[in-house]
Interface confidence: medium
């Protein structure tokens, strides 16, 4: 495929990626496959400018990211390392409450109405935004 | 013109509960780009940040995590007027107390206190 | 105590420049959030006096600057005068502890 050197239509670009934003909900996993039939993921945050963009845009709504701890470790869905990333929880977050009553505990990372992440149970129907790399190939076949 | 007006007894006794209230004129306690801090000042610890109350659709209250088994903010919509209780309280608590204010929007979501009230020393002291 | 380091004294004769740092980690300032001071007079509150790295508010004058850098932060004092005598304070955030952090703080000295 070619690289992409412009964001799809809708698509918001910023440093080099582009962003769409949902105005409706989904449950983390079917936010996740949308974004993936784009030829994208859930977004990732890797520092403080990134945040701030993403929270400008989605403002004070739970939204998630492609954070989450379902098969043990906090992962990122593009492999950025969790440990050594850019973090940015609400206190006392991620607790994988258990309380909430719908079963198991919470494995899905969202941004709170403040901007901060929390993890939620992966149900919940919550707005995401998609991301994807201006620089990588796309799944496109070239224009001949 | 906002102003933060403090209160609260000056001289706490040791494993007392220290107990200051901040009145807000010109601004809302429950004001959606604001939050609502209290930050102490000692020679021993300098400036430091204690925790907020806010409210987002729903109040929330952050802790530092050197108080926070101590500690308890209380926001009062009907009097605009938040409190501050710090449970158990030693010699080390000894500080001049401040309220304050930080602003938050999304279009510049830094924080940052650009409104204190004038502080409260408080002593404890048996 | 204090999460952000600064040197405990700075100080110059009327009219020089004196900078003074403040040094935090990769959970603060290097994580990217933004660095403010504040000035404080004897006997009163802080008062802000730059945000976001480099923003000053209405009434501060432009003599103040501040800048980052990596994971540290600066402020600099221009043409300084005898009434910017006072301590001088950095701030931000930490993401490891989910809560404001100060620097130790700076008594600035005009000789």
């Known amino acids: 495929g070619s690289e992409r050197t412009c964001c799809p239509v809708n698509w918001v670009e910023h440093e080099r990626s582009c962003y769409w934003f949902s105005r409706s909900g989904k449950a983390w996993a079917d936010a996740d496959n949308y974004c993936r039939l784009e030829d994208a993921h859930l977004v990732v945050v890797t520092s403080w400018e990134e945040q701030k963009f993403v929270q400008h845009h989605i403002g004070p709504v739970n939204t998630w990211m492609g954070l989450h701890d379902q098969n043990g470790p906090w992962k990122w869905v593009d492999g950025t390392d969790y440990e050594t990333g850019f973090k940015n929880w609400r206190p006392e977050q991620p607790d994988d409450w258990y309380g909430h009553g719908l079963g198991g505990g919470e494995d899905c990372a969202h941004f709170t109405d403040d901007g901060r992440w929390n993890d939620d149970v992966c149900q919940r129907p919550y707005r995401w935004v998609c991301e994807t790399e201006l620089d990588k190939a796309s799944q496109e076949p070239p224009l001949l | 013109q906002v102003q933060l007006q403090q209160s609260g007894p000056g001289l706490v006794k040791p494993s007392q509960t220290l107990s200051l209230t901040c009145a807000i004129s010109g601004d809302s306690v429950s004001s959606n780009s604001a939050a609502w801090n209290w930050i102490r000042q000692s020679p021993s610890r300098g400036l430091e940040w204690l925790g907020r109350t806010y409210y987002r659709s729903k109040w929330y209250n952050d802790y530092a995590v050197s108080v926070k088994s101590r500690i308890t903010f209380n926001p009062d919509t009907s009097k605009n007027q938040f409190s501050l209780r710090l449970n158990s309280v030693t010699p080390e608590d000894t500080a001049v107390y401040y309220c304050a204010r930080d602003r938050y929007n999304w279009n510049y979501p830094y924080w940052y206190f650009d409104l204190w009230g004038r502080g409260t020393l408080v002593t404890v002291s048996s | 105590q204090s999460v952000l380091t600064q040197p405990p004294s700075v100080s110059g004769a009327p009219g020089q420049r004196v900078t003074i740092s403040c040094t935090g980690s990769s959970s603060n300032i290097g994580a990217g959030f933004e660095v403010h001071w504040y000035q404080q007079l004897p006997g009163t509150a802080p008062k802000l006096l730059i945000y976001?790295?480099?923003n000053r508010p209405s009434g501060v004058p432009d003599r103040f600057s501040g800048s980052k850098s990596g994971t540290s932060a600066s402020l600099a004092i221009t043409g300084l005068q005898a009434e910017d005598e006072a301590d001088y304070y950095c701030?931000?955030?930490?993401?490891?502890?989910?809560?404001?952090?100060f620097g130790t703080g700076t008594k600035v000295t005009v000789l």
């Open positions: 701030q931000s955030y930490d993401s490891s502890l989910s809560g404001y952090v």
């Open positions: 976001g790295n480099s």
